[in-house]
């Protein structure tokens, strides 16, 4: 019977006849960096070219003793994951090993450094087709492994990592915490976060999806027809490299901000046990689970959008956090959120050439975060209109006056401490689509853009009563751009998006003694593109 | 220690002044930073990762390199370039004492650098 | 201009202490590893022992390991070589020398007899 | 440890000749650590050449050094009276550093 974990990353709605993409990874070479491997083992003999690459630490203790099986068990299991014969993810992808992890599992930044110039050295050498870099293995934070990492995504390769299993914030590790790379958590069987003895994975914004990661079966080094079931973050990154391996072979021309969007838009929502993770953590963690796209689905027509957040910006009164979107991705539109309700919104903000969202907190607040929707979206052009506060009762409004541009998200802003003590707005009056409503004392921006066939709506959903969260959803075939609440008063603690979904939070009203006057609604933008729409039809 | 010989002139250079401000003096505002990994036991101090500003041409990093290893010398101290980068990012890797590391943040064209740490298999 | 001056040299019984001082002076002395480099009458020139800027890292030459002692006031801009144990074979004029041995202390003699 | 033979032990020429001083290592020495030092009678000693070859401040263009690996030389092209003295070459790549036991380079 199939292993569970290859059960579970296949989709839902496949058929059997047709459940492999084409060449199953054939056209893509995914680079393994981890320790020695045993190349002849049956499950990979033959797909694994062994590179002369090897930048590894001695060995800690005097007294270790180099044992080849124990050398090579790590990268032999991983190497069967992504593309063995058997148990592997991608059945067709060449793999190619470069150790720069010891007998112990131990390696360093400076060695994986030299091994990912290698790669990008044998790339401008000998160009093949699309790349795919697995790093199994995780370190303290480090600018420069992020920053190298970061360059050779930019130089057109797919790096996947493990999250770590540290059960803490993969922000904490790297290459884990770099933005371009996929970083990957583990869950297992019951679509729990992998526990690994008193750790388990990591967690967190750093973390754009999960994978199986717990009893995987996969080849074992201790002889060549052995198999082995491990567990551990590793495993999991070697299923999306594996999947990336398969959605690459189908589509070479991806980008990795596509190769990303796609692997977050198949993958099965909200599976995973939240619980498991820390309170704090647990609205940042993607409830992800990466799943193979079904093979007769060119997903080219879809608006594909994710939901970036930011780092926390700290206590101080003036503090910001700033969220960001891949190279290639367009940021539509910018929220913000905090824990204690004491903020001062957010705005959309140009910074070397590229929008960012900003979030800002107040006097007396924990500290804010900004999330920013970043999607896929060609031929875009995106602009800011704001209006300042108007003072006046009826709150500020902001719409898209420019011909063909439409309202994809709105943000506002305010220098008051406590918009709570101010009178709130009556709701967007119906039929103006194109604009953006606000406190009287905020300013309020509208995020508006053209792009061929690009139609949006809004779609409002207000619960009269006080509620401690308000969430509206996107119909299928429309994806969410933009998510802010309705009205901006102090008890709400912010907006942000999950998936196709809108959730709009409050404080709990039992305990800050508001009134049910004070009603919450939550304002969704969904877009679509035509074009893209048309473009797929003329496909298929 | 063994490593490659080193080319001199930068020493040559810095020898020619006995006052110490002149040979050390910086080249620019010394605005380049140090980070070491916030995990202590990870720490591997003694290697470091000599980053240079982006636009820096690819010659500079050998040529970097070699200044730093000069000035070193001149002050006694050993270092050993272990590796110079140009494919990813402009740069080297050195093998020195931690003491040379003001000496190595004053160095033009210098960004950050950052003491080596380790990586686990996960 | 750089200088080097040695003092606290001596006649000293064997089995006795000494400690010898290199006050430098027209050079940022925290920036430079420093040597004590000893030479017996009529002899070749000995490394003895060094010590870096911050005076966290210290070599001896295994003739002294144990007995001789390398260290640094960085305030004073002062080396020290305390030596204990002191044999008949450690007689000789001791130099302090700076960094790549660019500069040299004019020396100090060292005589241990009974 | 690293082993500096020097040869010859004395070299005996006259003002206006050629010297040419030999360093042996008993392993290879980085040569950018490898310096040569004059001395004379009654004085500390005066770096001459450090890095193998290069020049220290003040050393005049006649004193040249060269040589990789595990071979070195000093050569002096045209002996000036105040060249006579004796000569050191020194490692300082390993420790523990190590100086040759000298050529004593004498008026003939």
């Known amino acids: 019977s199939i292993p569970w974990n290859l059960e579970r990353i296949t989709p839902a709605r496949y058929r059997a006849d047709e459940y492999q993409p084409p060449k199953g990874g054939s056209l893509v070479e995914v680079y393994l960096l981890d320790t020695s491997i045993q190349s002849d083992h049956r499950e990979i003999e033959g797909r694994v070219m062994v590179t002369d690459f090897e930048s590894v630490p001695e060995e800690d203790g005097t007294r270790f003793h180099r044992q080849a099986s124990k050398c090579d068990s790590h990268g032999t299991h991983l190497a069967g994951v992504v593309s063995g014969r058997d148990a592997g993810v991608a059945k067709g992808a060449g793999l190619r090993s470069l150790r720069v992890l010891n007998c112990q599992g131990k390696g360093t930044v400076s060695g994986t450094l030299i091994g990912l110039e290698f790669i990008r050295k044998s790339q401008l050498v000998q160009p093949v087709g699309p790349l795919v870099v697995l790093l199994p293995l995780a370190g303290g934070y480090s600018r420069v492994f992020n920053a190298a990492c970061q360059r050779l995504a930019r130089a057109g390769v797919v790096l996947v990592t493990a999250a770590g299993n540290f059960r803490d914030d993969a922000c904490l590790y790297s290459p884990a915490s770099a933005p371009e790379v996929i970083t990957v958590g583990a869950t297992n069987a019951q679509d729990q976060p992998v526990t690994l003895g008193t750790l388990g994975t990591n967690f967190g914004r750093c973390v754009d999806l999960f994978a199986p990661g717990e009893d995987i079966i996969g080849a074992s080094s201790d002889c060549s027809t052995c198999f082995v079931s491990r567990s551990g973050t590793s495993q999991a990154a070697a299923h999306v490299a594996g999947i990336a391996a398969m959605m690459l072979s189908a589509e070479p021309e991806l980008t990795l901000a596509e190769l990303r969007q796609r692997l977050i838009h198949f993958s099965a929502k909200d599976v995973i046990n939240e619980a498991w993770f820390p309170e704090d953590q647990r609205v940042l963690t993607p409830n992800l689970v990466a799943a193979l796209p079904p093979s007769t689905h060119r997903a080219g027509w879809q608006l594909f959008c994710r939901t970036v957040w930011s780092a926390h910006s700290g206590p101080t009164r003036m503090a910001t956090a700033v969220a960001r979107c891949a190279q290639d991705e367009e940021l539509l539109s910018c929220s913000s959120f905090s824990r204690s309700g004491k903020r001062r919104g957010e705005r959309i903000e140009a910074q070397g050439g590229k929008r960012v969202c900003r979030a800002h907190n107040a006097f007396g607040g924990e500290g804010v975060y900004a999330i920013a929707r970043c999607c896929l979206l060609p031929q875009v052009n995106c602009s800011v209109h704001t209006a300042p506060p108007a003072g006046a009762s009826m709150g500020t409004r902001v719409h898209c006056h420019q011909q063909g541009h439409v309202l994809t998200g709105c943000s506002s802003h305010w220098e008051v401490e406590d918009l709570g003590t101010h009178k709130p707005p009556v709701l967007r009056p119906r039929g103006q689509p194109n604009q953006c409503v606000g406190h009287r004392e905020a300013s309020i921006h509208a995020s508006c853009c053209h792009a061929p066939g690009l139609e949006c709506k809004v779609k409002e959903h207000g619960i009269p009563a006080p509620q401690e969260q308000v969430i509206v959803a996107c119909e299928d075939g429309w994806t969410l751009t933009g998510c802010s609440p309705l009205p901006g008063t102090s008890h709400v603690l912010g907006a942000y998006a999950v998936d196709n979904t809108c959730v709009v939070r409050s404080r709990d009203v039992s305990t800050t003694g508001s009134t049910s006057k004070e009603a919450v609604a939550a304002v969704a933008i969904c877009c679509r593109s035509r074009h893209l729409v048309q473009a797929s039809q003329e496909l298929q | 220690q063994e490593d490659e010989d080193g080319d001199y002139e930068e020493l040559v250079l810095a020898l020619r002044s006995e006052e110490d401000g002149l040979a050390d003096a910086p080249e620019h505002g010394a605005t380049a930073t140090f980070h070491r990994c916030a995990k202590d036991p990870w720490r591997l101090p003694g290697t470091y990762v000599v980053v240079l500003k982006e636009e820096t041409h690819r010659s500079q990093s050998e040529r970097t390199a070699r200044r730093l290893q000069a000035q070193a010398a001149r002050r006694g101290y050993l270092t050993k370039i272990l590796h110079v980068f140009h494919h990813l990012l402009p740069g080297f890797l050195v093998k020195m004492s931690g003491d040379l590391l003001e000496l190595a943040l004053k160095l033009p064209h210098v960004d950050y650098i950052e003491e080596d740490s380790s990586v686990f298999a996960q | 201009q750089v200088q080097l001056v040695e003092s606290g040299g001596g006649l000293v019984q064997p089995g006795g202490s000494l400690r010898l001082s290199c006050a430098a002076s027209?050079?940022?002395?925290?920036?430079?590893?420093m040597h004590w480099v000893r030479q017996a009458p009529g002899k070749g020139l000995e490394w003895v022992s060094n010590i870096s800027g911050s005076g966290s890292t210290t070599y001896y030459a295994d003739s002294v390991k144990g007995r001789f002692t390398i260290s640094r006031d960085n305030s004073k801009n002062t080396l020290y070589l305390q030596m204990n144990s002191l044999r008949a074979e450690d007689t000789a004029v001791y130099y302090c020398?700076?960094?790549?041995?660019?500069?040299w202390g004019q020396g100090t003699l060292v005589t241990v007899s009974s | 440890d690293i082993v500096l033979t020097q040869s010859p032990a004395t070299l005996s020429l006259s003002p206006g000749e050629r010297a040419t001083l030999s360093c042996r290592a008993s392993?290879?020495?980085?040569?950018?650590?490898l310096a040569w030092y004059q001395q004379k009678p009654g004085q500390a000693p005066r770096l001459l050449i450090y890095?193998?070859?290069s020049r220290a401040t003040g050393v005049p263009a006649r004193f040249s050094g060269s040589g990789s690996g595990t071979d070195f030389t000093l050569t002096i092209s045209s002996l000036e009276p105040e060249d006579f003295a004796v000569y050191y070459c020194?490692?300082?790549?390993?420790?523990?550093?190590?100086f040759g036991q000298g050529t004593k380079v004498e008026i003939k």
């Open positions: 890095g193998a070859s």
């Open positions: 020194q490692q300082w790549g390993d420790v523990p550093i190590t």
């Open positions: 392993q290879s020495v980085n040569s950018n650590y």
């Open positions: 027209g050079f940022t002395f925290s920036d430079y590893y």
């Open positions: 020398a700076r960094g790549m041995f660019d500069f």
